[in-house]
Interface confidence: low
């Protein structure tokens, strides 16, 4: 009932709560000299359910039969109606919808870890929209029998509170749990179990990894376990990985050998424990342990390759190059690279260690026969050394790749293709494609790219440190025994016209023609490969069409002459650049007067 | 040997900020885990916060729920702990650890203060109300 009620009475009967589709009836009745003043008779009950209107009857009461009320609590309230007053509230009744309790599903218990207390977990069901109140009983030996009332709205887990011992693992425990509402009540079926059953133990604990003699290959995980465990999982991976190694171990004792790891490698180890064969649950996987397996010794051999530049008629500049071993091959930190050159005929040999750099630089006589070695060394020893004899890689013309071409091949790759030399092309042991950014002046601090191609293959797709806009001066060796030949090409992966024309920086008159020089377009402004310069004049004050002469590009060149021009006839110069995409726009102009005679 | 000191501690206002400071002597931070706990009048001593200098990862206890951060300082060799909104119940008696940082460890070991191996004298934290 709500409020005081003092004018009269709302019943409900059969009663306040109340099986979804029954009917319900209703009284309002108001109390002795609580009507209208005047005219009793006129009294007006009006019953509302919430705010709306239902039923309404004059006189001392208000009977109201009501069907189809939906599930959850519905407020009915009576309202006293005289003449010329508002409408007076002489009472009310909420009247609850609901079911009766299903039975529970899927009751099952757990207690985790031998430390640990029984804990049940089930499923309600539908919801009853009443008050539910569930029991949850757990018989066992001697006779005895917990239990536990819940009282949450939405119950489905209890914690009984009580720690199962392992004493005698075969006795039986059933658990049952009762839902009880207003409607009716309902049971679970029975779950019965022993202590090995719903005991899940404890994730191990403690978790350490051991490497007998820093060596990979002895290796034991150690961890802790409760005392009643018999079987363990464990499962490994390399940190960077997604996939696991699954072992599966009994009687472990807290102690397992890994035959299988790889060197310098960070794993990560979860294990997980069972108290027995066939019954039970696993525990959860215990926390992490990442751990770093130690290094071994490099495996693999360094790919080399190298530079000769010619210094003067009796010395020569040598470049050394290698690529990083891989993390597989370098099975630890390569702490240096040891270079040996050595002059074969005369047995000198020089050795260095390169720390932090993956080049080297000597300079040599241009005489004898020399060759390299280049090893990689960890903390435990080093790869086996690559060794190269130093040659000239462009002497023999007719190991010269043919038609050679570089072609942009999507964003930042640049597929390069030749035809294999006149000469035998049999004897081809291997192709190289290198590049590298094409910098005016030919600078030797400029990376070096390369890969290396099988004698059968005559195409390659470059794309490590490939930029766009960017010329690349390409060559491709083919290699036989100890004799080379060359071509090389310019390519870009994307092309556009040059930002700028070259800078015209002096005209000078030499026997009745001038010579014209510039400065290069910056390469940041050249926008890819370069394929011609232009020279554009015309008489300073006509407004004819300029003449042009076009030159092909090259790298080293930055003067040109012009033999055309009349004498004491005074001109404008200027100069564009042209990629396969356009022309770039006008560089600087200059003007100038030839002094010399007229024909 | 590491010798650790504490320093910054104070008597506050609820609400206030404060920073402490841990200073190693004898020897760089630059292989250890450095973990803050905190000691309460009558309470064990509870874990706040940890550091691993080498890789530089931090480690909280989330019930102090972001209010208190981990930093270094590589030049000065110190770690500190900011602790912003401090409350009445952040009273206690600050301590810094030290371990030399070991090849593996377990997800919980920098929790531990039986994990640790050196320790400062401590410095005590006010917070009035």
């Known amino acids: 009932k709500i409020d005081a009620c003092k004018r009269g009475d709302v019943t409900v009967k059969p009663s306040h709560v109340i099986l979804l589709g029954s009917t319900v009836n209703i009284t309002c009745s108001l109390k002795p000299r609580q009507g209208c003043f005047h005219y009793s008779r006129r009294n007006k009950l009006i019953l509302y359910k919430f705010d709306r209107r239902i039923n309404f009857h004059h006189g001392h009461s208000l009977n109201s039969q009501v069907t189809g009320l939906p599930l959850g609590t519905t407020l009915f309230v009576c309202k006293l109606a005289c003449i010329n007053s508002d409408e007076i509230q002489i009472c009310g009744a909420e009247i609850f919808v609901g079911v009766a309790p299903e039975q529970p599903q899927n009751l099952s218990c757990i207690q985790k870890g031998e430390q640990g207390t029984v804990a049940c977990t089930w499923e309600r069901g539908r919801d009853t929209h009443l008050y539910t109140e569930y029991t949850l009983q757990l018989s066992g030996p001697k006779n005895l029998t917990w239990q536990k009332q819940c009282k949450d709205i939405y119950c489905d887990y209890l914690d009984f509170g009580i720690n199962l011992t392992p004493e005698s693992p075969e006795s039986n425990f059933t658990a049952k749990v009762t839902a009880v509402n207003s409607l009716g009540s309902s049971s679970s079926l029975p779950s019965t179990f022993t202590f090995l059953d719903i005991v899940r133990p404890l994730p191990p604990w403690d978790i350490r990894i051991k490497f007998q003699k820093a060596s990979v290959s002895r290796c034991t995980l150690y961890w802790r376990d409760e005392g009643l465990v018999l079987l363990n999982r464990l499962r490994y991976r390399p940190s960077n990985s997604r996939l696991w190694n699954m072992v599966n171990v009994t009687k472990a004792k807290g102690r397992h050998d890994l035959l299988d790891l790889k060197p310098f490698t960070e794993y990560e180890f979860q294990i997980s424990s069972k108290l027995h064969l066939y019954k039970g649950s696993w525990s959860d996987w215990s926390e992490s342990l990442r751990a770093q397996t130690p290094e071994e010794e490099p495996t693999g051999m360094l790919d080399v390759w190298y530079m000769k530049r010619h210094i003067d008629y009796s010395r020569q500049q040598i470049s050394l190059f290698w690529k990083n071993l891989s993390v597989s091959e370098a099975r630890g930190k390569i702490l240096h690279y040891q270079v040996t050159l050595q002059e074969l005929t005369g047995g000198k040999a020089m050795t260095q260690n390169i720390t932090g750099h993956t080049s080297w630089t000597t300079v040599i006589p241009r005489t004898g026969n020399w060759a390299v070695a280049v090893s990689a060394a960890n903390s435990k020893g080093s790869s086996l050394p690559t060794r190269i004899n130093i040659m000239n890689l462009c002497e023999a013309g007719l190991l010269a790749p043919r038609q050679v071409s570089a072609n942009s091949e999507g964003m930042d790759n640049i597929l390069v293709t030749w035809q294999p030399p006149r000469k035998d092309p049999s004897a081809v042991q291997e192709y190289v494609v290198e590049w590298r950014e094409l910098h005016p002046g030919g600078d030797t601090q400029v990376p070096l790219n390369w890969l290396r191609s099988r004698p059968y293959n005559v195409s390659a797709l470059i794309s490590e440190n490939i930029k766009s806009y960017i010329c690349y001066e390409i060559r491709v060796y083919a290699l036989s025994g100890d004799q080379g030949g060359c071509s090389s090409i310019l390519g870009n992966s994307k092309h556009k016209a040059p930002l700028s024309g070259p800078h015209i920086n002096a005209i000078t008159e030499e026997k009745g023609s001038i010579l014209i020089s510039w400065n290069s377009i910056p390469v940041q402004e050249q926008m890819g490969c370069l394929l011609h310069y232009r020279i554009y004049w015309k008489e300073r004050d006509s407004n004819s069409q300029p003449q042009l002469c076009e030159i092909p590009y090259r790298v080293s060149q930055n003067s040109h002459p012009i033999n055309s021009l009349q004498p004491r006839v005074t001109y404008v110069l200027w100069m564009t650049a042209l990629t396969a995409a356009g022309e770039s726009s006008h560089g600087n102009e200059r003007e100038f007067c030839l002094q010399g005679k007229a024909n | 040997q590491v010798q650790l000191q504490e320093s910054g501690g104070g008597l506050v206002q609820a609400g206030d900020s404060l920073r402490l400071s841990c200073a190693a002597s004898?020897?760089?931070?630059?292989?250890?885990?450095v973990g803050w706990f905190r000691q309460a009048p009558g309470k064990e001593r509870e874990f706040v916060s940890a550091l691993s200098w080498s890789d530089d990862t931090t480690i909280r206890d989330d019930s102090l729920r972001g209010r208190f951060t981990i930093s270094r300082d590589n030049a000065k060799n110190t770690v500190y702990l900011l602790m912003n909104s401090l409350k009445p119940e952040d009273t206690a008696v600050y301590y810094c650890a030290a371990k030399a940082k070991p090849p593996a460890a377990t997800w919980s070991s920098y929790r531990n203060r039986e994990w640790y191996d050196y320790w400062g004298q401590g410095t005590q934290v006010t917070v009035s109300s």
């Open positions: 004898g020897r760089t931070f630059d292989t250890y885990i």
